[in-house]
């Protein structure tokens, strides 16, 4: 059974992940056309189901494409280097989902824009945090 300290650690990690994802989303929402138009043509795979920490496997598998689009659309106003940002997210995701269990991610039938993708994972983090508090 999870201890209160491990639950607290999980909660802090999820909050950190949530902040990172929100920071990316805020950065994108500040982009003006035509950059935003271009970014929205970059498609992401969405999880069929995302209710448990193991489902973060689906996020992990899309981190490389996320870094790719952030690099391509790198703005002089975006102060964090995409590589560092995604690397931080990757470390948190690996710790949260655990490396002991191998989970095969199942994706939804339709791909989504970067905004829909980020919102989906932001909602996931908020949902899990709410169950922990």
């Amino acid at each position: 059974a999870p201890t209160s300290s491990s639950t607290k650690k999980t909660q802090l990690q999820l909050e950190h992940l949530l902040l990172d994802l929100q920071m990316i989303l805020n950065g994108i929402n500040n982009y003006k056309n035509p950059k935003l138009t271009r970014m929205l043509t970059f498609k992401f795979y969405m999880p069929k189901k995302a209710t448990e920490l193991k489902h973060l496997q689906c996020l992990e598998e899309e981190l490389k494409p996320l870094e790719e689009v952030l690099n391509l659309a790198q703005s002089k106003n975006f102060h964090l280097r995409p590589r560092d940002l995604i690397s931080n997210i990757n470390v948190i995701v690996l710790e949260l989902k655990g490396s002991e269990t191998t989970f095969m991610c199942e994706y939804a039938d339709e791909t989504a824009t970067i905004v829909e993708f980020l919102n989906r994972w932001i909602t996931f983090c908020q949902s899990i945090i709410s169950t922990l508090t």
């Epitope: 043509t41 498609k43 339709e110 791909t111």
Partner: antibody
Framework: EVQLVQSGAEVKKPGESLKISCKGS????????IGWVRQMPGKGLEWMGI????????RYSPSFQGQVTISADKSISTAYLQWSSLKASDTAIYYC??????????????WGQGTTVTVSS | DIVMTQTPLSLPVTPGEPASISCRSS????????????LDWYLQKPGQSPQLLIY???YRASGVPDRFSGTGSDTDFTLKISRVEAEDVGVYYC?????????FGGGTKVEIK
């Protein structure tokens, strides 16, 4: 090997309908946009439009909007270009192309072999 | 639509000699915020499908020899071949993808003298 294989040459009469295909293999079909390019006899290249098989998001060049329909069936990794009523001026070679996870950020790195469409009475 | 204009229409070349093709766009292809210039070059060899040579102004596509290079800024672009080889003959096209719809130049036919 990453490739796009197109359907064979077609000879049609004006007013007839037609659907040509482009099958992708050697890569994850739903990760990349598939575009269509026209080349009329002895002429240059014209970009017609594009589809994302992952969600069927489709964009047309204004010059081709309403003239053709672009579609895809991701279950068989195939994109289509179709006409409901062909005209003699549709006579051309049609190429399908692969264009990255975003058609703005990537060039057309893979091309089909082309489908020759001849429309003549 | 962005209009792409290529010159010359035809370019006779001598193997081993350098060659260059020009392309001009009706508006800037540079996104100054990103620092990306959304211009590609394609080669269509006789009887073949076109192939990507250069993307985003100056990046060589996979398998493209280093004798090909792309340069330019804003609205004026050049494809250079440092030493032309017989296999380089065909029609070269520039294409912009900064704005919808994507548009090609009219093409430059490179042939051996």
């Amino acid at each position: 090997e990453v490739q796009l294989v197109q359907s064979g040459a077609e000879v049609k009469k004006p007013g007839e309908s037609l659907k040509i295909s482009c099958k992708g293999s050697g890569y994850r079909f739903t990760s990349y946009w598939i575009g269509w390019v026209r080349q009329m006899p002895g002429k240059g290249l014209e970009w017609m439009g594009i589809i994302h098989p992952g969600d069927s998001d489709t964009r047309y060049s204004p010059s081709f909007q309403g003239q053709v329909t672009i579609s895809a069936d991701k279950s068989i990794s195939t994109a289509y270009l179709q006409w409901s009523s062909l005209k003699a001026s549709d006579t051309a070679i049609y190429y399908c192309t692969r264009q990255g996870r975003s058609f703005y950020y990537y060039g057309m790195d893979v091309w089909g072999q082309g489908t020759t469409v001849t429309v003549s009475s | 639509d962005i209009v792409m204009t290529q010159t010359p229409l035809s370019l006779p070349v001598t193997p081993g000699e350098p060659a260059s093709i020009s392309c001009r766009s009706s508006q800037s292809l540079l996104d100054s915020d990103e620092g990306n210039t959304y211009l590609d070059w394609y080669l269509q060899k006789p009887g073949q499908s076109p192939q990507l040579l250069i993307y985003t102004l100056s990046y060589r596509a996979s398998g493209v020899p280093d004798r090909f290079s792309g340069t330019g800024s804003d609205t004026d672009f050049t494809l250079k071949i440092s030493r032309v080889e017989a296999e380089d003959v065909g029609v070269y096209y520039c294409m912009q993808r900064i704005e919808f719809p994507l548009t090609f130049g009219g093409g430059t036919k490179v042939e051996i003298k």
